[in-house]
């Protein structure tokens, strides 16, 4: 018979074919894993299911962003009786199955991490063949990617009344603190706009008025490191132009 129940592990409404009272569908994932940009991470995911000794076709899937509807980043399929889950999808070739789905393990390795990978991931298993059933983690695992600061843009821009302003944009996690130094400035935190909407790891600092010619240096720092970059302002006196 078919029944619907609430799974307490994932607090997920799930319909299952009831075949044995010994086990039920559940998924075990940690709330969060952390790793540094450029390194690798492991997203653990194990599950239990009610279909004892199931050896039919199965598919393992990982999604990003949101459960059920989020884009797939990894998918593999194992034929009946096979221990090998053949990869059918690995986004950018960076997702690799570590676990053996036949042994209830869907754990995934993510290589060459980038700050853009900082999101929630959801594992899912699908049974086909004699038994048709599927289950997906609802809460997923948050991948927290940390990164030393990197200055992505530094520039001098014209502003009204023949003046100039400087902008420095850096990325990092934790979001870096930015400081400007330069002629007659000392060390200035300047006008920090952080983090930008939809760009959670980007921080921008502005020097609204560059009053002296010379070298202006932006320094970005967080608990993982620091980075700096400079721009030069040289105005042609008697003219309205500037060289940077």
């Amino acid at each position: 018979f078919v029944r619907t129940k609430i799974d307490t592990t994932e607090n997920l409404l799930n319909t299952e074919v009831h075949s044995s009272p010994a086990q039920r569908w559940s998924m075990q994932v940690p709330p969060e894993v952390s790793a540094e940009a450029g390194d690798a991470a492991v997203l653990p995911c194990t599950f239990t299911h009610p279909h004892r000794h199931y050896d039919g076709p199965l598919t393992a899937i990982w999604r990003a962003g949101e459960p059920y509807a989020g884009p797939q980043v990894f998918r593999c399929a194992a034929a009946r009786g096979s221990e090998l889950c053949q990869t059918a999808l690995s986004l950018h070739g960076r997702f690799r199955l570590l676990g053996n789905p036949r042994r209830n393990d869907l754990s995934l390795r993510v290589e060459r991490l980038a700050l853009a990978d900082d999101r929630r991931y959801f594992c899912r298993v699908e049974f086909a063949g004699d038994v048709h059933d599927r289950y997906e983690s609802r809460h997923g695992v948050r991948l927290h990617v940390t990164a030393a600061p990197r200055i992505v843009n530094i520039s001098v821009l014209p502003s009204p009344a023949h003046a100039f302003r400087a902008l420095c944009t850096a990325e990092g996690e934790p979001p870096p603190a930015l400081a400007w130094s330069g002629p007659a400035l000392g060390n200035s935190l300047a006008a920090v706009r952080s983090p930008r909407e939809g760009h959670g790891h980007l921080v921008t600092a502005e020097l609204p008025a560059l009053t002296h010619d010379g070298r202006y240096t932006c320094t970005a720092a967080n608990s993982l490191g620091r980075s700096e970059a400079s721009v030069y302002l040289f105005r042609f006196h008697g003219a309205s132009g500037a060289s940077t």
Partner: antibody, heavy 121, light 111 residues
Framework: EVQLVESGGGLVQPGGSLRLSCAAS????????MNWVRQAPGKGLEWVAQ??????????FYAASVKGRFTISRDNAKNSLYLQMNSLRAEDTAVYYC????????????WGQGTLVTVSS | EILMTQSPATLSLSPGERATLSCRAS??????????IHWYQQKPGQAPRLLIY???NLASGIPARFSGSGSGTDFTLTISSLEPEDFALYYC?????????FGQGTKVEIK
Amino acid sequence: EVQLVESGGGLVQPGGSLRLSCAASGFNFNDYFMNWVRQAPGKGLEWVAQIRNKIYTYATFYAASVKGRFTISRDNAKNSLYLQMNSLRAEDTAVYYCARSLTGGDYFDYWGQGTLVTVSS
Amino acid sequence: EILMTQSPATLSLSPGERATLSCRASQSVTISGYSFIHWYQQKPGQAPRLLIYRASNLASGIPARFSGSGSGTDFTLTISSLEPEDFALYYCQQSRKSPWTFGQGTKVEIK
């Protein structure tokens, strides 16, 4: 039965080139990553290169000691793995093993018997 | 790159005895409980053979007297009771970070 059979080894002068081949059988070659691992006479094992499969865009990886000199490639239609070795040095003298690895793990679950490359003048 | 150090270089034991081989990595090779360390056996004139993968998983066809343990930087291969065919060279290998690196090997010889 999984089988990996290497060929192409031999004696070559320093600065010369050699192309090793590995014929695979007994498994679906397309599903696996393939590697070359070498062992200098009386020494330990050294991983040389890896080539991934189609899903992983045939990405290649090399040990620093051979990068720029060696090229790993595969021909899935022929179930074959290759290692093109250029600018050979005396320290490249070794038995070269072809080894298979699963897409999920960079360990080597099956190995060939190896082919000896000797670089000497 | 990650440096793998095995000890002892040689282990002299008798058949039936317990063998304990150590492997130390220069940095942690464990991520989220997964240890990227693997063990191989090599006999003279033969190719290596996978014994243990990811620290503690027995490879296909390997007898249960072989076991692996450890986490972080320190790992152990144990042979519970040595059989005559177990006298050979043993290597550990890490796949935590490319390039994949091997230890220098431990030779298990008959005492």
